[in-house]
């Protein structure tokens, strides 16, 4: 460990969010997409 | 995401006093936590941080005076072992290493006789 | 220990105006970037402005604006509002997992 308390950076947590953002809206429309097909 | 602290009280000099900082949203395996105090009409003053790998640093003046500890998934204390009127002071705990990127609203301490 | 020297400790400046803020270490911040800046009004807790000693947090203004390395940093804030009233604080993060804020700079808005 480095980087010690560094490793929970902003930059890191960006990052971390706009995964978090990503992933939401992709499962989103993976399930909108299945109610709209039954 | 947020911090919340809690446990802030007046107290007598020399009596043990332990604040809670409580985080929502995201995992104390991954964050690291800091105690940071603000005397009325003074600066933020640094006491310490809990590491993601469960170490922990105090600012040299700190020292034997502080506790930090991590107490549960959503928890983080900071344990002053004996307080004086020098304490007083609003305490928040704020998430991030070497930068502080969410803080929580504060508690109030105040060490009086 | 490290020492982090904020100046001026007040300044004055009327709307639209620009204001400076420095901020220097007695020792070099980790990796020479870890200095940040936090605006603090009364009554309320700081806010994060700027990491790693010049890029804005999540929806802070680009009228904010951090600048600096190793020991010398620098907040400048342009075109001010009424609303940039306020305390302004750096922390920097050292080796050995230290942290240190400077002593704060008020700011008035005439």
């Known amino acids: 460990h480095s980087d010690g308390i560094f490793t929970d950076s902003y930059s890191r947590y960006r990052k971390q969010m706009a995964v978090k953002k990503y992933l939401a809206a992709v499962l989103g429309k993976r399930y909108k997409q299945r109610v709209k097909n039954k | 995401q947020s911090v919340e602290e809690s446990g802030g009280r007046l107290v007598t000099p020399g009596t043990p006093l332990t604040l809670t900082c409580t985080v929502s949203g995201f995992s104390l395996s991954s964050a690291a936590m800091n105690w940071v105090r603000q005397a009325p009409g003074k600066g933020l003053e640094w006491i310490g941080i809990?590491?993601?790998?469960?170490?922990t640093y105090y600012a040299s003046w700190a020292k034997g005076r502080f506790t930090i500890s991590k107490t549960s998934s959503t928890t983080v204390d900071l344990k002053m072992t004996s307080p004086t009127t020098e304490d007083t002071a609003t305490y928040f705990c704020a998430r991030g290493g070497g930068e502080f990127f969410i803080w929580g609203p504060g508690t109030l301490v105040t060490v009086s006789s | 220990a490290q020492v982090l020297t904020q100046t001026p400790s007040s300044v004055s400046a009327a709307v639209g105006g620009t204001v400076t803020i420095n901020c220097q270490s007695s020792?070099?911040?980790?990796?020479?970037?870890?200095l940040s800046w936090y605006q603090q009004k009364v009554g309320q807790p700081p806010k994060f402005l700027i990491y790693?000693?010049?890029n804005l947090a999540s929806g802070v203004p680009s009228r904010f604006k951090g600048s600096g390395s190793g020991t010398q940093f620098t907040l400048t804030i342009s075109d001010l509002e009424c609303d940039d009233a306020a305390t302004y604080y750096c922390a920097g993060g050292y080796s050995g997992n230290m942290v240190d804020f400077g002593g704060g700079t008020e700011v008035v808005v005439k």
């Open positions: 020792q070099s911040v980790y990796k020479n970037k870890y």
């Open positions: 809990f590491d993601p790998y469960s170490s």
């Open positions: 790693q000693a010049s």
